[in-house]
C-alpha cells in the first residue's frame, strides 16, 4: 500500500480493509487477521466478533466487514444482530426461570419461543368456541351464540395470572 | 475514533447505590457490546457485565445480584448502577467497548475512581 | 470461571533486550477454525489498558511488531523482542472464551 497523499490528512485516502499505521510513518496497511475496517480513514481496524458458545457463525468476517452470528440448534436469536441465544422450547410452552414449562389451562403457544397466551374470548366479539384450545393453538371462533342451537356454550375461562417469560443470560 | 469517557461521583456512602455513565464519541453505540471493568487500587481487573445496545445484558454472576446495566442509544451512553456498595467496591471503574461479548477489549475510558467512605 | 495464572509476577529487564511472560488457562481457551480466545493487555502507569494481542496471537492494529504473542490451548506466552523504556507497566492476560471473562494477576515490567 502506498502512501497517502492527502494534503489535509494524509490517513483520508486508506481505503476500507486497511488502516492508518502510526508505526509506517501513517501508511496505509492491511487490517490484521480476525480484524476489519468497513470505512476509509480508519486509524485502527475493529477485531471481528467471535461466534462462540450457543452462538454460530452465520457469516464469515472479511476485512471490510464484521462476522454475523445466529444460534445453534435448539436456540434462537434474541435482540438486535442477534446479541443473545434463547433456548428453544416445545409448542405448548414457555420458557421460565426453571426452564420450560407447560402452558397453563386457559392459554396457549404456538411457537418454540415466546410466552403462552390467553385462549381469545370468543364471547367479547360476539361469537361462540367452535373449537376448543388447546395448549399448542387458540381456541376456534364460530358464529355467534344465536346462530346456534340452544345450550350451546361460550364461555371461555379468564387467563390465569403467569410467570413472565425469561432470558437465561 | 471512538472515545469513551466515564462521569459520576468520585465519593458514594456506604450502603448506597453506585451511578455511573459512560458516554460514547466518535461513532455509534449499535452494534457493539459494552462493558464495565473494575480495578481497585493496586490490584487486578475485574469484568463487571456487559450490555448490548439493543439492551440485552450479561452480569458477573459474583455480582448479579448488585449490579444493573442500562443503555440509552439516543444520547449514546450506557450506565453502570451498584448497589449496597461497601470500601471493597472502591476502585477505578473502566467502560470499555467489547468486541464479542466478554472478550477483547479494544476501546477503553479512562477510568474514574469511586471510593466508597461515609 | 476459567482461572488465568500468569508468571513471573515481576520482571525486571535491561532496555533492548528481550522479555517473555507466561499465561496459564484452567481449560483450553481454543475454539473452532483454531481461534484461541486469549487476549493480551498492557496498563501502563496512570493509564487504562491497552489491548497489544487477541486471538492469541494476532497484534491489535497499531501495536509495534516487537510484540508478539504465542500459544494454544492453556499455555500461552507474549515476547517483547527488544524492550523499550515506553514498555513499562503491568501486562495482563485474558480469557475471552467463556462469561465472565477473567484476567490474569498481572505481569509488572520495569527497566533494570
Known amino acids: 500500500f502506498e502512501r497517502t497523499r492527502s494534503l489535509q490528512d494524509p490517513c483520508s485516502n486508506c481505503p476500507a480493509g486497511t488502516f492508518c499505521d502510526n508505526n509506517r510513518n501513517q501508511i496505509c496497511s492491511p487490517c490484521p487477521p480476525n480484524s476489519f475496517s468497513s470505512a476509509g480513514g480508519q486509524r485502527t481496524c475493529d477485531i471481528c466478533r467471535q461466534c462462540k458458545g450457543v452462538f454460530r457463525t452465520r457469516k464469515e468476517c472479511s476485512s471490510t466487514s464484521n462476522a454475523e452470528c445466529d444460534c445453534t440448534p435448539g436456540f434462537h436469536c434474541l435482540g438486535a444482530g442477534c446479541s443473545m441465544c434463547e433456548q428453544d422450547c416445545k409448542q405448548g410452552q414457555e420458557l421460565t426461570k426453571k426452564g420450560c414449562k407447560d402452558c397453563c389451562f386457559g392459554t396457549f403457544n404456538d411457537q418454540k419461543r415466546g410466552i403462552c397466551r390467553p385462549w381469545t374470548n370468543c364471547s367479547l366479539d360476539g361469537k361462540s368456541v367452535l373449537v376448543n384450545g388447546t395448549k399448542e393453538r387458540d381456541v376456534v371462533c364460530g358464529p355467534s351464540p344465536a346462530d346456534l342451537s340452544p345450550g350451546a356454550s361460550s364461555v371461555t375461562p379468564p387467563a390465569p395470572a403467569r410467570e413472565p417469560g425469561h432470558s437465561p443470560q | 475514533q471512538v472515545q469513551l469517557q466515564e462521569s459520576g461521583p468520585g465519593l458514594v456512602k456506604p450502603s448506597e447505590t453506585l451511578s455511573l455513565t459512560c458516554t460514547v464519541s466518535?461513532?455509534?453505540?449499535?452494534?457493539?457490546?459494552w462493558s464495565w471493568i473494575r480495578q481497585p487500587p493496586g490490584k487486578g481487573l475485574e469484568w463487571m457485565g456487559y450490555?448490548?445496545?439493543?439492551?440485552?445484558?450479561n452480569i458477573n454472576p459474583s455480582l448479579k445480584s448488585r449490579v444493573t446495566i442500562s443503555v440509552d442509544t439516543s444520547k449514546n451512553q450506557f450506565s453502570l448502577k451498584l448497589s449496597s456498595v461497601t470500601a471493597a467496591d472502591t476502585a477505578v471503574y473502566y467502560c470499555?467497548?467489547?468486541?464479542?461479548?466478554?472478550?477483547?477489549?479494544?476501546?477503553w475510558g479512562q477510568g474514574t475512581l469511586v471510593t466508597v467512605s461515609s | 470461571e476459567i482461572v488465568m495464572t500468569q508468571s513471573p509476577l515481576s520482571l525486571p529487564v535491561t532496555p533492548g533486550e528481550p522479555a517473555s511472560i507466561s499465561c496459564r488457562s484452567s481449560?483450553?481457551?481454543?475454539?473452532?477454525?483454531?481461534?484461541?480466545?486469549l487476549d493480551w493487555y498492557l496498563q501502563k502507569p496512570g493509564q487504562s489498558p491497552q489491548l497489544l494481542i487477541y486471538?492469541?496471537?494476532n497484534r491489535a492494529s497499531g501495536v509495534p511488531d516487537r510484540f508478539s504473542g504465542s500459544g494454544s490451548g492453556t499455555d500461552f506466552t507474549l515476547k517483547i523482542s527488544r524492550v523499550e523504556a515506553e514498555d513499562v507497566g503491568v501486562y495482563y492476560c485474558?480469557?475471552?472464551?467463556?462469561?465472565?471473562?477473567?484476567f490474569g494477576q498481572g505481569t509488572k515490567l520495569e527497566i533494570k
Open positions: 450490555i448490548y445496545y439493543s439492551g440485552s445484558t
Open positions: 470499555a467497548r467489547d468486541q464479542s461479548g466478554g472478550g477483547s477489549f479494544q476501546h
Open positions: 486471538g492469541g496471537s
Open positions: 481449560q483450553s481457551l481454543l475454539y473452532s477454525q483454531g481461534y484461541n480466545h
Open positions: 466518535g461513532g455509534s453505540i449499535s452494534s457493539y457490546y
Open positions: 485474558m480469557q475471552a472464551l467463556q462469561t465472565p471473562p477473567t
